[in-house]
Amino acid sequence: MMTGTIETTGNISAEKGGSIILQCHLSSTTAQVTQVNWEQQDQLLAICNADLGWHISPSFKDRVAPGPGLGLTLQSLTVNDTGEYFCIYHTYPDGTYTGRIFLEVLESSVAEHGARFQIP
């Protein structure tokens, strides 16, 4: 039975040209985290594997930094970065947990952080 929950940074906004940290946290389970995938819609951004470390997709290498923690830092943001991002925790023996973050990249300087929420 999957007992864990994923807490994410929720709906967030940031300014064009700036950077943002995408964070997820898996709690309420003792399952072993073997890998965390970060995806944007259907595109793989990065993987953090327990044994193999970090892999950043070549097309994002220049503006995606691994961490902090199991998070991901997106740099030099463009309006095209607006959209859904997913953290996918592969665990044993529970299976897969997925968290969703919506990022809006704004032209103006009124970018504000949204509220946190939990996905069971």
Epitope: H25, Q35, G53, W54, H55, I56, A65, G67, G69
Partner: antibody
Amino acid sequence: QVQLQQSGVELVRPGTSVKISCKASGYTFTNFWLSWVKQRPGHGLEWIGDIFPGGDYTNYNEKFKGKATLTADTSSSTAYIQLSSLTSEDSAVYFCSRSTIISGAYWGQGTLVTVSE
Amino acid sequence: DIKMTQSPSSTYASLGERVTITCKASQDIKSYLSWFQQKPWKSPKTLIYYATRLADGVPSRFSGSGSGQDYSLTISSLESDDTATYYCLHHGERPYTFGGGTKLEIK
């Protein structure tokens, strides 16, 4: 298996600088963050900063900015820390360490730096 | 910076005894916590990572627990080889910080 082999003991003069190496083997050097940690007797362990050789990202503890410079040579899978303007306060054992959060850290054997006239 | 308050700073315990060491963070560190064992003139050895996960090759008498701000390392039945100094480390956001250490000795 994962190994971090550090350079040997350094005895250096005050005001000079020293460069310590940490040669990694048994894993893909560019895929992991590598931290440097300082240990002085009675002062516990202090995190100096870390480097991600795969993207040449570095982070520093504010306390060590201007004192420590972290670099990495991907061709030889070696990380370096350079300590400048040395004083007796810099006499310590320096460790390199590799971690991914979701797996345990591996540590080098440590390098003793003694600053003395 | 996040401050890690580790206690006790030193303790004596008998062989076979259960020993618990705690670390309190100044804010929620989301389980980004490791425990290390260090013997004199040796490099630290990872015991626990991600708050509760046992590192490879570490005896099962060691266990980690906690979440949020409060974490603990427990040795279920103390052995003579466990004489060492133990440190916690938070590594969720930089700068990473260590607890002050707990020196564990056998009575």
